[in-house]
């Protein structure tokens, strides 16, 4: 057992059919020494008596919120939440595997530059009585800041029968360095806890590794006189680290006929523009990659031939 | 009608053990919260153990500090409490009940502790 924060404690169970739990004291936090009673919940009945009561926790029916009172007048409360243990692993029933880019991959995480600003995001199908809390730190056994704001739900999605929940969170390294060649990992705890039953997930990576740049900006087309060429131009996003020619993108540039059948034709430059053919009802698009460490492109900036 | 009868006190030595039985009759031990409790020559009565309904899980006064264990045999709708390392401060009558307050109690059975 330990505490999750002021008189919430996890209890962590060996979860298999008669198992036999965990013996877990509770004391009332009070000066008063007799006449002490405990009940559970919402319910009068009577657990025991005494400053300190040992109870043996093996299911969901004994976690819950354990009050001790006095003469009908309460003097502190301590909330049990289960963290269940099956054939040596640790339950994630509340998160969904976004299998992307591999299976048990529950967290997943973007940085937009190297600024050490980043965010996070999990997904659920559980809409009520559903807390998240999120710690990080560069490294783990000397941790360095890092700060981590409220996570929020951000979207909603129908998936066939269930409704999907997309919670996020973002988080800032409190001491970054951009151009700094990293050493030690991102780490990130998220403690999930629905009803009573605690879980935690975590995710370990490099800023590098998980940058996806925000897309081209200002794209535009300039035909050019007498050929069905066009002149391609756009500009780095302006979330991108500087300067630019430090912190360097490199770009796709494709032209996509209407029929997502027809044969794309894909140019890849280091130059913020590039001459390509317009077909009609085509349309341009443009994508961005960190020029020297092969993460994420970013998402398509788009316009049409026409 | 509704009775709970205990047996299996007796005198022990310091260190020793007995196993309390708690026979029901009229109601379903296993649908309900089960205590025992004890009461010393000249005190009051006090708690020792709780069993809950469902998996069956226990609670114990501090005083227990693992010698005792609670459970019961929903076939045979008794409850028990076995005593180990016995010592003279848990000479007692010991009663089970069916509530908190003690309206459904039997007589009790007693337990001496004495070289």
């Known amino acids: 057992i330990w505490e999750l924060k002021k008189d919430v404690y996890v209890v962590e169970l060996d979860w298999y059919p008669d198992a036999p739990g965990e013996m877990v004291v509770l004391t009332c936090d009070t000066p008063e020494e007799d006449g002490i009673t405990w009940t559970l919940d919402q319910s009068s009945e009577v657990l025991g008596s005494g400053k300190t009561l040992t109870i043996q926790v093996k299911e969901f029916g004994d976690a819950g919120q354990y009050t001790c009172h006095k003469g009908g007048e309460v003097l502190s409360h301590s909330l049990l939440l289960l963290h269940k243990k099956e054939d040596g692993i640790w339950s994630t029933d509340i998160l969904k595997d976004q299998k992307e880019p591999k299976n048990k991959t529950f967290l997943r995480c973007e940085a937009k530059n190297y600024s050490g600003r980043f965010t996070c995001w999990w997904l659920t199908t559980i809409s009520t009585d559903l807390t998240f809390s999120v710690k990080s730190s560069r490294g783990s056994s000397d941790p360095q800041g890092v700060t981590c704001g409220a996570a929020t739900l951000s979207a909603e999605r129908v998936r066939g029968d269930n409704k999907e929940y997309e919670y996020s969170v973002e988080c800032q390294e409190d001491s970054a360095c951009p151009a700094a060649e990293e050493s030690l990992p991102i780490e990130v705890m998220v403690d999930a806890v629905h009803k009573l039953k605690y879980e935690n997930y975590t995710s370990s990576f490099f800023i590098r590794d998980i940058i996806k740049p925000d897309p081209p900006k200002n794209l535009q087309l300039k035909p050019l006189k007498n050929s069905r060429q066009v002149e391609v131009s756009w500009e780095y996003p302006d979330t991108w680290s500087t300067p630019h020619s430090y912190f360097s993108l490199t770009f796709c540039v494709q032209v996509q006929g209407k029929s997502k059948r027809e044969k794309k034709d894909r140019v890849f430059t280091d130059k913020t523009s590039a001459t390509v053919i317009c077909r009609k009802n085509a349309s341009i698009s443009v994508r961005a990659q960190d020029r020297y460490y092969s993460s994420s492109w970013s998402e398509w900036a788009s316009v049409p031939c026409s | 009608e509704v009775q709970l009868v205990e047996s299996g006190g007796g005198l022990v030595q310091p260190g020793g053990s007995l196993r309390l039985s708690c026979a029901a009759s009229g109601f379903s031990i296993s649908n309900n919260w089960m205590y025992w409790f004890r009461q010393a020559p000249g005190k009051g009565h006090e708690w020792v153990s709780t069993?809950?309904?469902?998996?069956?899980?226990?609670a114990y006064a501090d005083f227990v500090k693992g010698r005792f264990t609670i459970s019961r045999d929903n076939a045979k709708n008794t409850l028990y409490l076995q005593m180990n390392s016995l010592k003279p401060e848990d000479t007692a009558l010991y009663y089970c009940?069916?509530?908190?307050?003690?309206?459904?109690r039997g007589q009790g059975t007693q337990v001496t502790v004495s070289s």
């Open positions: 069993i809950k309904t469902g998996a069956g899980s226990t």
């Open positions: 009940a069916r509530d908190w307050a003690g309206t459904v």
